[in-house]
Interface confidence: low
């Protein structure tokens, strides 16, 4: 048995005579067989949950569910339980009913076994019938909303006459109808204005009815109607077996160049039309259990239950429904050298579903890991600058397909024919697994004898210690100029433009620092600033060359305060800016600046 | 019979708004989910949004994320697309549509459209 | 989201030829596919749905086929009245997408 509501609400007013009806509250069936009997708790409750004082006052018919007054509430026991309302006014009293059998005690109140009846209290005697607008001669003031279990019996879930107006107003007409669709299962029976569903209801079919409850009003020569929400929630149990959308049991996945620990290998939808068990008790009550395979295959992998509500069509409404998603992860990173190929089974359980048929489907994983090879181009050929400052970067050698890598750790080394023209340096980028070649030792650099440059390029994988190799040829073009004096470490030092382009930088490749223009759109991305190279900096990432030295790049880099009008990088740099963003590394300082309008003009005059 | 019919086109500014209603009549309007569609001139069909039967389940397609908003008032039989910020990428004959209570997210009724065209 | 392509963009065609339009997904979508006819300044009209269903009322010379991926519309004696551009609509998942169109002209 349950009630088809959590709540009931009435008014009650000082001196109503004992014996005046107040309401009826209903239960449902969960069985044919059930019958259900009600039963009041002792208590009138008051503001937050205070228990006010031992319920004298009302009763209940055990087998209808009538609420009466038993005896009149007049002034002083008003007053008295007012008193106890820890200094609140008592404008609401509420008591608690249960159904009987029920284990539940008196300080608990959870639906479906026990429901909560609100009285708004009046300390006033209820009013003259004439005074009753229609409003109140139809509906309780809160408007009513009702919850009714799938699958199970019909029955009478609501009353609509208000039983203190229809008891101490009898010459006010109140007729009750309800609009509805067409071939909707409720009713309301004319003579006892009972509501009830004509047949057990299908959640999976609709889910809410937004029915309306329309009263019309005879009071004498004037007929008024009033319409209000008559809203009823179905509530699901788990009669939906789980099934395959469109039929897909089998996925299939090639693990190759994503080789990462936790990297998804492949997913499987189920469906079920259901929404329990609710999300709490899901993952323990709809398991996903990896089948033994070989010791390899369960170490290798596990499959991770992702549960998400969605809706579904039904006879042009929405209904919500469960998909749950199977995913295949990996339990660890992969070496390269790994090669098989397997079925993996996943055996999912609906342990709440009671049939007819199974909860039960078997998901199929065919799976092939590959083996990776390292390959390099066979040579490189780039150029360098004479002019380029230390830590410039000059390109990347990359391992084939090394920017889809993940999981796979390769390092590269430089070893250099000349040993004294050993100019660069290579240091692998942790992003994609390409190695970043810069520029090292500008003295080196320098020296006329070093105008070509060989070096052999090195790609090992950390794990298996399998290794690629390439040429790399670096031509050194141009001719050194020395900086002029006073110019800072850090191109972003400089604010304006024409000290920004007359300085070098370190990281900067030409020797010259870079001006990046901004676009003048309050605070951006696009910020005006100095920089050793706008290819590499800022770009919103501190990379693994920018890291050596905070010089080089302190927009993406800085770990310090930024002054002025910013978005902070994550989780350093300057993500936006306002205007010029400057920076000062050795003060772990940078500041984003209106642009200055009258830089131009000025610098022209003071040449 | 069904009959859907579309009203609140013209000529809309760049980054200004506009409101398109759709009337339905001749089925029970609160018991299906309604769509708007759109088609630019010459160009072929776009789902802009969705909206359930009760207005419980709203979805807007990425590209008005954030500046259309679907509604419904099941009272006066009506869908609503509200459409702020536009853009001439929003130029397009606007289309309602009823969803088939067969096969749920099939159109089985269009209106005739009401076209928009922003430009300043 | 699920990408749709139609082809062939545009076919000419005579009175009483048979047809074959062509659609396909992205990614697997069931049988969770519809076919629209629209004319000139017309809205579109449902054909079929569920990959292979007659839509109620529409004639017999058009049929729907495939599943998963790969998806046909075949008119089986082209009439006058069927001069047309055809679309194919996924219904398997939101954003709800169309194919580009076949427009069917007279030869």
């Known amino acids: 048995l349950y009630f088809s509501r959590d709540a009931y609400w009435e008014k009650l007013y000082v001196d109503q005579a004992a014996g005046t009806p107040l309401l009826y509250v209903h239960a449902l069936r969960d069985a044919p067989e059930e019958v259900p009997s009600f039963r009041l708790g002792q208590h009138l409750y008051g503001t937050y949950r205070t228990r006010l004082h031992e319920n004298n006052w009302i009763c209940i018919q055990e087998d209808t569910g009538l609420l009466y007054l038993n005896r009149s509430l007049d002034h002083s026991s008003w007053e008295k339980l007012s008193v106890r309302n820890r200094g609140f006014p008592l404008l609401t009293v509420y008591l608690k009913v249960f159904l009987s059998p029920t284990s539940l005690r008196e300080g608990e109140c959870q639906w479906p076994g026990c429901a909560r009846v609100y009285f708004s209290f009046f300390n006033t005697s209820f009013p003259a019938c004439s005074s009753l607008k229609p409003r109140e001669l139809c509906f309780p003031e809160t408007r009513p909303s009702f919850r009714i279990r799938e699958n199970r019996p019909p029955g009478t879930f609501h009353q609509f006459r208000l039983l203190p107006v229809q008891f101490l107003c009898p010459n006010i007409s109140v007729a009750y109808r309800l609009l509805e669709g067409e071939g909707l299962p409720f009713r309301c029976a004319p003579d006892s204005l009972e509501v009830s569903t004509r047949w057990a209801l299908d959640r999976e079919q609709r889910e809410k009815y937004e029915l309306v409850a329309v009263c019309t009003v005879h009071a004498g020569a004037r007929e008024e109607v009033v319409m209000v929400p008559f809203p009823v929630t179905v509530y699901d149990e788990d009669d939906s077996a789980p099934t395959f959308p469109a039929g897909v049991d089998t996925a299939s996945a090639v693990v190759e160049f994503k080789r990462k620990e936790d990297t998804v290998v492949a997913t499987l939808r189920v469906f079920d039309a259901d929404v329990v068990p609710a999300s709490g008790e899901l993952v323990r009550r709809y398991t996903s259990t990896l089948l033994p395979g070989d010791t390899w295959a369960q170490q290798t992998f596990r499959v991770e239950h992702w549960p998400n509500e969605t809706s579904v069509q039904a006879n042009g409404s929405f209904v919500r429904a469960t998909v749950h998603d199977y995913r295949l992860v990996l339990n660890r990173n992969l070496s390269i050298s790994e090669n098989r190929t397997m079925q993996l089974a996943v055996l999912v359980n609906d342990s709440d579903f009671q049939g007819p048929g199974a909860g039960v489907l078997l998901l199929h994983f065919n799976v092939s890991v590959l083996p990776v090879s390292l390959h390099l181009p066979s040579t490189y050929s780039l150029s360098v600058s004479r002019r380029a400052r230390r830590f410039a970067q000059i390109g990347k050698v990359c391992v084939e397909n090394c920017q889809a890598f993940s999981g796979i750790n390769v390092q590269y080394k430089l070893h250099s024919s000349g040993a004294n023209c050993s100019t660069l340096g290579v240091v692998t980028s942790a992003e994609d697994t390409s190695g970043i070649l810069f520029v090292n030792d500008t003295k080196a650099l320098r020296r006329p004898k070093c105008a070509e440059l060989h070096y052999m390029v090195v790609a090992t994988d950390q794990q298996t210690s399998r290794q690629a190799q390439a040429q790399l040829l670096v031509t050194v073009e141009g001719s050194y100029v020395a900086e002029e004096a006073g110019c800072p470490l850090s191109c972003a030092v400089s604010k304006r433009r024409l000290e920004c382009e007359e300085c070098g930088g370190l990281g900067s490749p030409t020797g010259r620092c870079e001006w990046r223009q901004g676009d003048g759109k309050g605070i951006t991305r696009n910020f005006s600033t100095c920089s050793p190279s706008t290819k590499t900096c800022p770009d919103g990432h501190c990379d693994v060359v920018e890291t050596q030295d905070i010089n080089i790049c302190p927009q993406d880099c800085l770990r310090g305060s930024i002054v002025g009008g910013h978005e902070p990088g994550e989780p350093r740099g300057i993500k936006a800016g306002y205007g010029t963003c400057n920076c000062f590394p050795e003060e772990e300082k940078c500041f984003c600046e209106p642009e200055d309008i009258q830089d131009p003009l000025c610098d022209e005059l003071c040449r | 019979q069904v009959q859907l019919v579309e009203s609140g086109g013209g000529v809309g500014q760049p980054g200004r708004s506009l409101r398109l209603s759709c009337v339905a009549s001749?089925?029970?309007?609160?018991?299906?989910?309604m769509h708007w569609v759109r088609q630019a001139p010459g160009k072929g069909l776009d789902w802009v949004a969705i909206i359930g039967y009760d207005g419980s389940k709203e979805y807007n397609v990425d590209s008005v994320k954030g500046r259309f908003t679907i509604s419904r008032d099941n009272s006066k039989n009506t869908l609503y697309l509200q459409m702020n910020s536009l853009g001439a990428e929003d130029t397009a004959i606007y289309y309602c549509?009823?969803?088939?209570?067969?096969?749920?997210?099939?159109?089985?009724?269009w209106g005739q459209g009401t076209l928009v065209t922003v430009s300043s | 989201d699920i990408q749709m392509t139609q082809s062939p963009p545009s076919l000419s065609a005579s009175v009483g030829d048979r047809v074959t339009i062509t659609c396909r997904a992205s990614?697997?979508?069931?049988?969770?596919l519809n076919w629209y006819q629209q004319k000139p300044g017309k809205a579109p009209k449902i054909l079929i749905y569920a990959a292979s269903r007659l839509q109620s009322g529409v004639p017999s010379r058009f049929s729907g086929s495939g599943s998963g991926t790969d998806f046909t519309l075949t008119i089986s004696s082209l009439q006058p009245e069927d001069f047309a551009t055809y679309y194919c609509?996924?219904?398997?998942?939101?954003?709800?997408?169309f194919g580009g169109g076949t427009k069917v002209e007279i030869k």
């Open positions: 549509a009823r969803e088939s209570p067969i096969t749920g997210t099939t159109f089985d009724y």
């Open positions: 609509q996924q219904s398997y998942s939101t954003p709800l997408t």
């Open positions: 001749g089925f029970t309007f609160r018991n299906y989910g």
């Open positions: 990614q697997s979508i069931g049988n969770y």
